[in-house]
Interface confidence: low
């Protein structure tokens, strides 16, 4: 059952599993979700009854039934951790707290002109996990205005005290505001010989590097395979750390595999969904419960739905056994992961997908996409939405895309004219314009929000967002998909589809199918050749074929131009601009959607 | 205000070359395809050539391809036209003009149509 | 190349009536024609594009229809300024070619 209220004066008793410093009930809460156990916790807030060394305390908790006892105690708040919940959940905290010194190991001291600079240089700094900065108002004359980056090994502060005059908050990664790289290769045969902050097992390596990517101080990593010589170090996940970021030695060894940590990009990655299947392979943990289930994709469900299970293993019926079904072993650990592996024995493992909400919904993998052929089918752009505009008579006004379940984004040259955001209707999960009557369902729109720096689509800024007047649940034929990623600024995306009902031709009509074209990006130098009475700024991206004939139209603008990267569909461009349609030499001018993820992040994230 | 000023028209014996030139002025020359149109005496219009923007496509009709060349310098806001190998045929006036375009996001379209004339420069080709 | 026949050639109406001008494209233009009127001794001027799309600037009494391959050119409510030679143009691709022209005077 999903409990969301925080009980006041409240202290849940017994089941303690660890206790960390939060500088609020609400984020003690995240850091419970975030646990691999914890599934209730009792926090102290400051208080006069209260010894001050209890203030700020966490007490992660857990419990076979899911609740503990409750006893009244002043200053106590308690709750229930969100993995008893289905909505969507973020680790992202943007708040920053006032006479508040939250400790931790200081490894970095400089001067900052605000709180706001000293927490973007927590978040550029691949160490930092939270800041305190002395306001100018601090007694200290020489500790004024200083910027104080910490990190500690769980990620959350030692202590918190009470300090006045200084501000506290934490970095703003998982917040997908990180300038720093995503470096996603995997490298085989290699190994980071730099010092280990924990080990787990795992099935390989790219759990291994999900592992390390939600790890408080795991920046790189290093996994031995099955095949590694070494029996007793098989499917183990090494997570390491250096002072410099970066691995200091890299040694050549076979059935070896390493890589980085994605922060910088987890984002638009799945780092806690583990839904692969594991064949001939069994996980060992501690036994939750053993039931009959049809198959793996059963045991997975279950494991789904039992609040406590992390990971499973599924052995098949032996032939006309127990009606056809398995067992469904359900299991857990202390820190998430099966405290051995082993291989051979015909068993099928996986993980619990109760945690692939802890990831953005813009990672779901989609159904695989009809190649070739210009219409598309039903589902294969579920992020896509027709945008309507009633007046003077309802029609097709622009596309968009959906990035949240509240938010489109668009262009603003689409909104030339509307006057008021009560003439626009969103349609989503529609292939063909024709099913569109006046019983279909809608979002209204409760706010357009246009770049101020927009003046017409050519000098770019094109772009907006639309904020709905009720959310989007998210089906296979709606949901949202993935900005790309600061740290992604130099991939090379060769993937790319723009999609819309716009125009086939220069001189046609909106089309009644979604329709799709494959269409090459091309460098802003090129680009810029084919349009020389235009400046095309690094904030415009553009695509095209050299010899024409392939292009987003008239009624595509507002769209998206989605590239796929790692599995992940990415909205890399908004359809702006272009001479004519489909030109030789004239490529279509998107609206770089990487370059304003921050003011996407800020808009849709104003409190 | 828009303004399209011809210059370099005259008589000129059959065979021979004539240069027509263009100043342009009152809008931003480099976004604009540019076009000659010719209208000979009492007759109707003829399209003679066009170039884009940024001077890198020329179009010719088969009347007029091999002995006209259309050019551009968007630097001095000047439009061309040399004339080579003239014929009795050729003598019209000629008028420099502008490509219109929308400017508005994919409503930002090319359009083969002119918004804006010159008041022209009447070539006679006789001997 | 697209070949563009106007009718009449020429047309004599009073001042106050309408006039309607043809338009006939040899294949399917898809509504890229544009009207231009050219008064005695002075360059054309665009009136009308995309078959009905006004020109900023041109009086409401000119009106565009037409779709495929035959479209006309409505003036209502005729007046003196009128007088002039209207052309059509059809710009489905950028070999644009002209009609013959048709001639306004007033009765």
């Known amino acids: 059952e999903c409990v969301t209220q925080l009980l006041k004066d409240t202290c849940f008793e017994g089941g303690d599993i660890t206790t960390v410093f939060t500088p609020s009930a609400k984020y003690c809460q995240v850091v419970c979700t975030y646990h691999p156990r914890c599934l209730l916790f009792t926090f102290t807030a400051e208080s006069p009854s209260e010894d001050p060394t209890r203030w700020f305390t966490c007490v992660l908790k857990d419990s076979v039934t899911e609740t503990l006892p409750r006893v009244n105690r002043t200053a106590a708040i308690s709750g229930y951790s969100f993995k008893q919940c289905s909505h969507q959940i973020s680790a992202c905290n943007k708040d920053i707290y006032v006479d508040l010194d939250m400790k931790g190991i200081n490894y970095n001291s400089s001067v900052a002109k605000s709180a706001q600079e000293c927490q973007e240089r927590c978040t550029d700094d691949v160490h930092c996990h939270f800041f305190t900065y002395a306001t100018r108002q601090f007694p200290s004359l020489e500790h004024r205005n200083i910027c104080l980056l910490k990190h500690t090994q769980t990620g959350t502060p030692t202590r918190i005290t009470k300090l006045d005059k200084v501000v506290s908050g934490f970095s703003l990664k998982s917040c997908a505001l990180s300038n720093l790289a995503c470096i996603r290769d995997i490298f085989p045969n290699t190994v980071f010989a730099d010092s280990n902050i924990d080990s787990v097992m795992a099935p390989d390596a790219f759990v291994c590097g999900r592992i390390c990517t939600h790890h408080p101080g795991c920046l790189f990593f290093t996994f031995f395979s099955q095949e590694w010589p070494k029996e007793s170090q098989r499917n183990l996940c090494l997570l390491k750390t250096s002072e410099s970021g970066l691995p200091s030695t890299r040694i050549k060894k076979s059935k070896a595999l390493s890589g980085f940590s994605l922060q910088s990009c987890r984002h638009s990655i799945p780092v806690f969904c583990h839904s692969s299947f594991y064949h001939d392979t069994d996980f060992l943990g501690e036994e939750l419960d053993i039931v009959a289930a049809k198959s793996h994709e059963a045991c997975q469900k279950l494991c789904t739905n039992a609040v406590r299970c992390q990971f499973f293993t599924y052995t098949p019926a032996q032939a006309s056994c127990n009606e056809g079904k398995g067992k469904c072993y359900l299991k857990l650990s202390s820190n998430g992961s099966p405290t051995k592996i082993l291989h051979g024995r015909g068993g099928i493992s996986g993980y619990t997908l109760r945690l692939c909400k802890m990831d953005n919904e813009c990672t779901t993998k989609i159904k695989p996409r009809i190649v070739g052929g210009t219409a598309s089918v039903r589902g294969e752009w579920p992020w896509q939405v027709t945008l309507h505009t009633t007046s003077p008579t309802q029609r097709h006004l622009c596309g968009g895309s959906i990035i949240g379940n509240q938010w489109i984004l668009t262009a603003a040259h689409c909104f030339y004219g509307v006057e008021s955001p009560k003439i626009l209707r969103v349609y989503s999960g529609i292939l063909n314009q024709s099913e569109i009557k006046e019983d279909t369902s809608f979002f209204g729109v409760q706010e357009i929000i246009i770049h101020d720096q927009y003046k017409m689509a050519e000098s770019g800024y094109d772009i907006a967002l639309l904020k709905l007047e009720t959310t989007v649940n998210y089906t296979d034929s709606q949901r949202p998909i993935c900005l790309p990623s600061k740290g992604d600024r130099n991939v090379i995306y060769t993937d790319c589809w723009v999609t819309g009902w716009g125009y086939r031709k220069l001189r046609d009509k909106i089309q009644n199918t979604l329709q799709k074209a494959k269409i090459p990006l091309v460098t802003n130098e090129e680009c810029q050749k084919r349009y020389r009475g235009h400046k095309i700024t690094h904030k415009m991206i553009c695509a095209g074929y050299r010899e024409g004939g392939k292009d987003a139209c008239k009624g595509d603008s507002g769209g998206p131009l989605s590239c796929k990267h790692n599995e992940v569909w990415h909205l890399v461009g908004i359809t702006s601009w272009g001479e004519g349609c489909a030109q030789r030499e004239r490529p279509g001018v998107y609206t770089n959607v990487v370059e304003y993820v921050d003011w996407i992040l800020e808009k849709t994230q104003a409190v | 205000e828009v303004q399209l000023v011809e210059s370099g028209g005259g008589l000129v014996q059959p065979g021979r070359s004539l240069k027509l030139s263009c100043v342009a002025s009152?809008?931003?020359?480099?976004?604009?395809?540019m076009t000659w149109i010719r209208q000979a005496p009492g007759k109707g219009l003829e399209w003679v050539a066009s170039i884009t923007d940024n001077g890198g496509s020329t179009y010719y009709p088969d009347s007029v391809k091999g002995r006209f060349t259309i050019s551009r310098d968007n630097a001095k806001s000047t439009l061309y036209l040399h004339m080579n190998s003239l014929r009795s045929e050729d003598t019209a006036t000629y008028y420099c003009?502008?490509?219109?375009?929308?400017?508005?996001?994919?409503?930002?379209?090319?359009?083969?149509?002119?918004?804006?004339w010159g008041q022209g420069a009447s070539v006679t080709v006789s001997s | 190349d697209v070949r563009m026949t106007q009718s009449p050639a020429s047309l004599s109406a009073s001042l106050g009536e309408t006039v309607n001008i043809e338009c006939l494209a040899s294949e399917d233009i898809y509504s890229d024609l544009a009207w231009y009127q050219q008064k005695p001794g002075k360059s054309p001027q665009l009136l009308i594009y995309n078959a009905n799309s006004l020109q900023n600037g041109v009086p409401s009494r000119f009106s565009g229809s037409g779709s495929g391959t035959q479209y006309s050119l409505k003036i209502s409510t005729l007046q003196s300024e009128d007088v002039a030679t209207y052309f059509c143009q059809q710009y489905s691709n950028y070999r644009r070619t002209f009609g013959g022209g048709t001639k306004l005077e007033i009765n």
């Open positions: 009152g809008f931003t020359f480099n976004n604009h395809w």
């Open positions: 003009t502008r490509d219109r375009y929308d400017s508005d996001g994919y409503y930002y379209v090319r359009y083969y149509v002119v918004d804006a």
